[in-house]
Interface confidence: medium
């Protein structure tokens, strides 16, 4: 179960913020109808990544990847998949 | 649906203290350079963002979590 499959829009926004890509961030935020104050808030977070340089993006990306692929999340994802399978089976 | 552990990480990044956030990160990735980086990012966000900014970021996260794309 890939982490991005659990909530793709979250990871789109996270990696746009962490990569310092303003265009990508705008595109991702448009998909969830972000208001102007919400966009401003996210750009302030993005500024911190940009100011701290490439390694900051890499290291925080590692944290997010590690949490997302940890037992805490993978167990959850597997459980959700089992529940989905049960529902699909019952629905037939 | 977003994993609760990821949600907790993001919530602490915005609303927790630097120590709380770094402690949370340490549970998953305890490399010294990673923890140092986490603290610096957290301190930067706390310095740049007003309470209103943080509320706006949290309301955006709610939109993300409840989006059909999540």
């Amino acid at each position: 179960v890939k982490m991005a499959e659990t909530c793709p829009i979250f990871y789109d926004v996270f990696f746009a913020v962490a990569n310092g890509n303003e265009l990508l961030l705008d595109l991702s935020l448009t998909k969830v109808n972000a208001t102007e104050p919400e966009r401003t808030a996210m750009k302030k977070i993005q500024d911190c990544y940009v100011e701290n340089g490439l390694i900051s993006r890499v290291l925080d990306g590692l944290v997010m990847t590690t949490i997302s692929s940890s037992k805490d999340c993978m167990g959850e994802a597997v459980q959700n998949t089992v529940e989905d399978l049960k529902l699909n089976t019952l629905g037939r | 649906e977003i994993c609760p552990a990821v949600k907790r990480d993001v919530d602490l990044f915005l609303t927790g203290t630097p120590d709380e956030y770094v402690e949370q990160v340490a549970q998953y990735k305890a490399l010294p350079v990673v923890l140092e980086n986490a603290r610096i990012l957290k301190n930067c966000v706390d310095a740049k963002m007003t309470e209103e900014d943080k509320e706006n970021a949290l309301s955006l996260l709610d939109k993300i979590y409840t989006s059909p794309l999540c």
Epitope: N52, G53, L54, I55, V58, L59, L62, T65, T66 | K29, A30, L31, P32, V33, V34, E36, I40
Partner: antibody, heavy 120, light 107 residues
Framework: QVQLQESGPGLVKPSETLSLTCTVS????????WSWIRQPPGKGLEWIGY???????NYNPSLKSRVTISVDTSKNQFSLKLSSVTAADTAIYYC??????????????WGQGTLVTVSS | DIQMTQSPSSLSASVGDRVTITCQAS??????LNWYQQKTGKAPKFLIY???NLETGVSSRFSGSGSGTDFTFTISSLQPEDVGTYYC?????????FGQGTKLEIK
């Protein structure tokens, strides 16, 4: 291919300040952490400290009061200063690059090392 | 500081022998351990990261294992070019620390 080259005086008098520079070629200094490590003749390795291109540093507590590491991104160089030296600071001084991956933090590239002798 | 204790401090083996070096950490370091090889008059060379992962381009006769506090470095079939001193290095906590080294010679 990344290459690191240490430079500086090979002889320093006791109580003076040891100054070394590491020049990085074949890659940018801006994307990594960079360390100084030393090795007294015939002995083991001791980490001195690291620097990130932004100027952020972390030093070994055993040397912290005497160490300063700085960076000059325009020259792709980082430097070490060790004050109040004694004969115990006689060592080969290496500069090295950190490679940080998801679970690892390694010194993947090293300079060839420069011997610094503390003697009057 | 985390103390790293290597053993033996020196060893002599014949070409083709299987050679094992151990490294013990004074506290749990997960698998945050590297191994380096240093030949006389040269800078250390990075061999293994994460306790057991071989660095790209390093011979597969080198291997590592262990987690927590006890780690092992193995050369499956000793070659003349393997002569040198081997160091373990922990990066689980600052300051980074190294083992005192194991000097490997050919009989």
């Amino acid at each position: 291919q990344v290459q690191l080259q240490e430079s500086g005086p090979g002889l320093v008098k006791p109580s003076e300040t040891l100054s070394l520079t590491c020049t990085v070629s074949g890659g940018s200094i801006s994307s990594y952490y960079w360390s100084w490590i030393r090795q007294p003749p015939g002995k083991g390795l001791e980490w001195i400290g690291y620097i990130y291109y932004s100027g952020r540093t972390n030093y070994n507590p055993s040397l912290k009061s005497r160490v300063t590491i700085s960076v000059d991104t325009s020259k792709n160089q980082f430097s070490l200063k060790l004050s109040s030296v004694t004969a115990a600071d006689t060592a080969i001084y290496y500069c090295a690059r950190h490679r940080v991956t998801r679970t690892a933090d390694s010194f993947d590239y090293w300079g060839q090392g420069t011997l610094v002798t503390v003697s009057s | 500081d985390i103390q790293m204790t290597q053993s033996p401090s020196s060893l002599s083996a014949s070409v083709g022998d299987r050679v094992t070096i151990t490294c013990q950490a004074s506290q749990d370091i997960n698998n945050y351990l590297n191994w380096y090889q240093q030949k006389t008059g040269k800078a250390p060379k990075f061999l293994i990261y994460d306790a057991s992962n071989l660095e790209t381009g390093v011979s597969s006769r080198f291997s590592g294992s262990g987690s927590g506090t006890d780690f092992t470095f193995t050369i499956s079939s000793l070659q003349p070019e393997d002569v040198g001193t081997y160091y373990c290095h922990q990066y689980g906590d600052l300051p980074y620390t190294f083992g005192q080294g194991t000097k490997l010679e050919i009989k």
